[in-house]
Amino acid sequence: CKAMHVAQPAVVLASSRGIASFVCEYASPGKATEVRVTVLRQADSQVTEVCAATYMMGNELTFLDDSICTGTSSGNQVNLTIQGLRAMDTGLYICKVELMYPPPYYLGIGNGTQIYVIDPEPCPDSDF
């Protein structure tokens, strides 16, 4: 297993609709064709997997049907969006990138993006 640098923003504020987006960029040492991206949440010293997707370079990210994440890729950048967030979901969201194929296997873990979520009052006759 070889190490790889992963960069992500330090702080993101979720929208009033509970949507947060951030870019996860990795320094690919080679020409990977298959990449796996995992979003981990760290809060109260507990780490849980939020979502994960494997994609072939040049193709769309494919998350599970019931995933709360969506994303797109462009070169060595992955644009991740998490939806349905509320105040209790505030925490550090860590981007983990694995270059699965071809060998050698590379692993990179970002420092995390602190996502802040506020529960707003709904506006009259609207969805926030």
Epitope: T48, D65, I82, Q83, G84, M88, D89, F128
Partner: antibody, heavy 123, light 107 residues
């Protein structure tokens, strides 16, 4: 095991207030939102509001704003819902239900409900 | 206001039938939708969450699909105990509105 136990049935007069409580056990009370839902006799489900027990922040449906007050007591793992200025059409069964943060992916929203509290408003 | 419209409002089907109930939402809610079954005199029971995830302990004859604004609950083979009213609910954000319900009866 996870339980939400609600207070007993109430009979109130129009214009009065009612307070329904929901005591949680079997899970970390401050890690889940609690919703209030009501159901009038023979009618559908109606969402009333949500409370974050850890901070006490609330959101209520527009229809109930100004009339509903939701509170939490972390020392007893209890949330309460008070509805004021009662009318006959507030006669309903009132339910509480828990709801995890969405990133708690192993738990489903509204997976556990209280047994319901019948509130009858009659002169 | 955000509207959830279920169709049909009532339906009658035979044991073993495939039954489909639809829920249309007035705004895009991605996949954040629940389905419930409520038998007479009982509390609502969660069947499906996030549009297609089967809640633990729920029979596999129940399935959900859809995203955005159009969702479907399917019972692959109707059983006598499925006599109930079915509700959809958006869990995207407040208000966590319910559909008006679909009353299912056995022929």
């Amino acid at each position: 095991q996870v339980q939400l136990v609600q207070s007993g049935a109430e009979v109130k007069k129009p214009g009065a207030s009612v307070k329904v409580s929901c005591k949680a056990s079997g899970f970390t009370f401050t890690s889940y939102y609690i919703h209030w839902v009501r159901q009038a006799p023979g009618q559908g489900l109606e969402w009333m509001g949500i409370i974050n027990p850890s901070g006490g922040s609330t959101i209520s449906a527009q229809k109930f704003q100004g009339r509903v007050t939701m509170t939490s007591d972390t020392s007893t793992s209890t949330v309460s819902m008070e509805l004021s200025s009662l009318r006959s059409d507030d006669t309903a069964v009132y339910y509480c239900a828990r709801d995890p943060p969405i990133t708690m992916v192993r738990d489903a929203p509204f997976d556990y409900w209280g047994q319901g509290t019948l509130v009858t408003v009659s002169s | 206001d955000i509207q959830l419209t279920q169709s049909p409002s009532s339906l009658s089907a035979s044991v073993g039938d495939r039954v489909t109930i639809t829920c249309r939402v007035s705004q895009d809610i991605s996949r954040l939708l629940n389905w419930y079954r409520q038998k007479p005199g009982e509390i609502p029971k969660l069947l499906i969450y996030r549009a297609s995830s089967l809640q633990s302990g729920v029979p596999s004859r129940f399935s959900g699909s859809g995203s955005g604004t159009d969702f479907t609950l399917t019972i692959s083979s109707l059983q006598p105990e499925d006599i109930a009213t079915y509700y959809c609910q958006r869990t995207y954000s407040a208000p966590y509105t319910f559909g008006q319900g679909t009353k299912l009866e056995i022929k």
